[in-house]
């Protein structure tokens, strides 16, 4: 008789998940000499231990603590780039501006980026068929709790001027329900963080509006100011030119507004 299996609304665990996590860990530790002490097998065992045999709607931050401990990493606290709904450009930026870091430039963020995973209560199996959807099923699922945990720790570590890249093409440029809006904003430490500087990325070629005046940006400014952190905002009208000028700052066209 086949065992009854819970059908969730979201996609199942990414295929070859264990091998992918192990491979990413090995690659990361090869590239980053400061992380060579990390034992990737132990990292995988801790990662797996966070969700295997547990109900995928009953995962806690505590479940991920052994993994967090193994993945402890020091990044320059004044070189942190947060992002919301514009991951690709943020990653392109830190690939050029090598001294700045997104969460996905850290070991733990790199391991889990774009992956899905979950287990089943009381079995050691990984569920490759379906996993809980944050909206339709439950918020305390393995993937959401992981990102909430690492995002909180990343924001807590930030200091001085923290940058955030926001998508100016979205109806809500700042979304209170995003990971940035619900987790990172509230975990910046006012004793350490002087300023949050938002970079609003424009989508249209002819879009010359000042998106820093957008009501959702004003809402972000209000939240940040109430936390005794200064706020500043810049329009990035030409993201392609912006990246080009990060690569080649001496270029004569890079003195004008981008």
């Amino acid at each position: 008789v086949p065992r009854w299996r819970q059908q969730w609304s979201g996609p199942g665990t990414t295929k070859r998940f264990p091998e992918t996590v192990l491979a990413r860990c090995v690659k990361y530790t090869e590239i980053h000499p400061e992380m060579r002490h990390v034992d990737c097998q132990s990292v995988w065992d801790a990662f797996k231990g966070a969700f295997i045999s547990k109900h995928p709607c009953n995962i806690t931050e505590e479940d991920y603590q052994p993994l967090m401990k193994l993945g402890t990493q020091t990044v320059p606290c004044n070189k942190i780039l947060l992002w919301s709904r514009i991951k690709d450009l943020a990653h392109q930026f830190t690939q050029v501006q090598r001294d700045m870091f997104t969460l996905e430039d850290t070991l733990l963020g790199y391991l889990a980026d774009d992956l899905t995973w979950c287990g089943e209560f009381n079995t050691s199996k990984i569920n490759y068929q379906s996993c809980p959807d944050w909206r339709k099923d439950c918020s305390n699922n393995p993937v959401s709790v992981f990102w909430k945990t690492v995002s909180r720790r990343f924001a807590e570590a930030a200091c001085d001027v923290v940058h955030v890249m926001l998508n100016g093409s979205r109806s809500k440029i700042f979304d209170k329900n995003s990971t940035f809006g619900s987790v990172e904003v509230h975990n910046l430490q006012p004793e350490k963080v002087q300023t949050l500087e938002a970079w609003v990325i424009h989508g249209g070629r002819e879009d010359s509006r000042d998106l820093c005046q957008d009501p959702t940006i004003k809402e972000l400014e209000s939240i940040i100011s109430k936390r005794n952190i200064q706020f500043s905002c810049k329009n990035i009208y030409r993201p392609d030119k912006f990246l080009q000028c990060v690569k080649n700052p001496e270029d004569s066209s890079c003195t004008s507004e981008i």
């Epitope: 091998e19 192990l22 090995v26 034992d39 990737c40 097998q41 132990s42 065992d45 050691s124």
Partner: nanobody
Framework: EVQLLESGGGLVQPGGSLRLSCAAS????????MSWVRQAPGKGLEWVSG????????HYADSVQGRFTISRDNSKNTLDLQMNSLRADDTAVYYC???????????????RGQGTLVTVSS
């Protein structure tokens, strides 16, 4: 270029001991898990034992548990397998392998050496 060179194989009587060694080069040894894999005559490959990059985690096949001990020296880029209480069914070509690690009984291999023959016979 990755190179894995096994040594220490030979003929040994049942109940005897043997120590296999593997010299690794061409990659950052300490970040890779290492394993011993064997192939008995006319049989498929069997994952014998694995050790994590730092040496903190080890894994043994049920068939060798308590008899074989895997170890590594990251300062010398070497992998060893101490084999005690050898039996006739341990006769095989033993390969040193580097890889990403393992999940349960699945070993994720990248490279494998040429092998060294172990014969257990009276």
């Amino acid at each position: 270029e990755v190179q894995l060179l096994e040594s220490g194989g030979g003929l040994v009587q049942p109940g005897g001991s043997l120590r296999l060694s593997c010299a690794a080069s061409g990659f950052i040894f300490s970040v890779y898990a290492m394993s011993w894999v064997r192939q008995a005559p006319g049989k498929g490959l069997e994952w014998v034992s694995g050790i994590s990059g730092s040496g903190g985690s080890t894994h043994y096949a049920d068939s060798v548990q308590g008899r074989f001990t895997i170890s590594r020296d990251n300062s010398k880029n070497t992998l060893d397998l101490q084999m005690n209480s050898l039996r006739a069914d341990d006769t095989a070509v033993y390969y040193c392998a580097s890889g990403k690690g393992w999940d349960g009984n699945t070993w994720y291999e990248d490279y494998r050496g040429q092998g060294t023959l172990v014969t257990v016979s009276s």
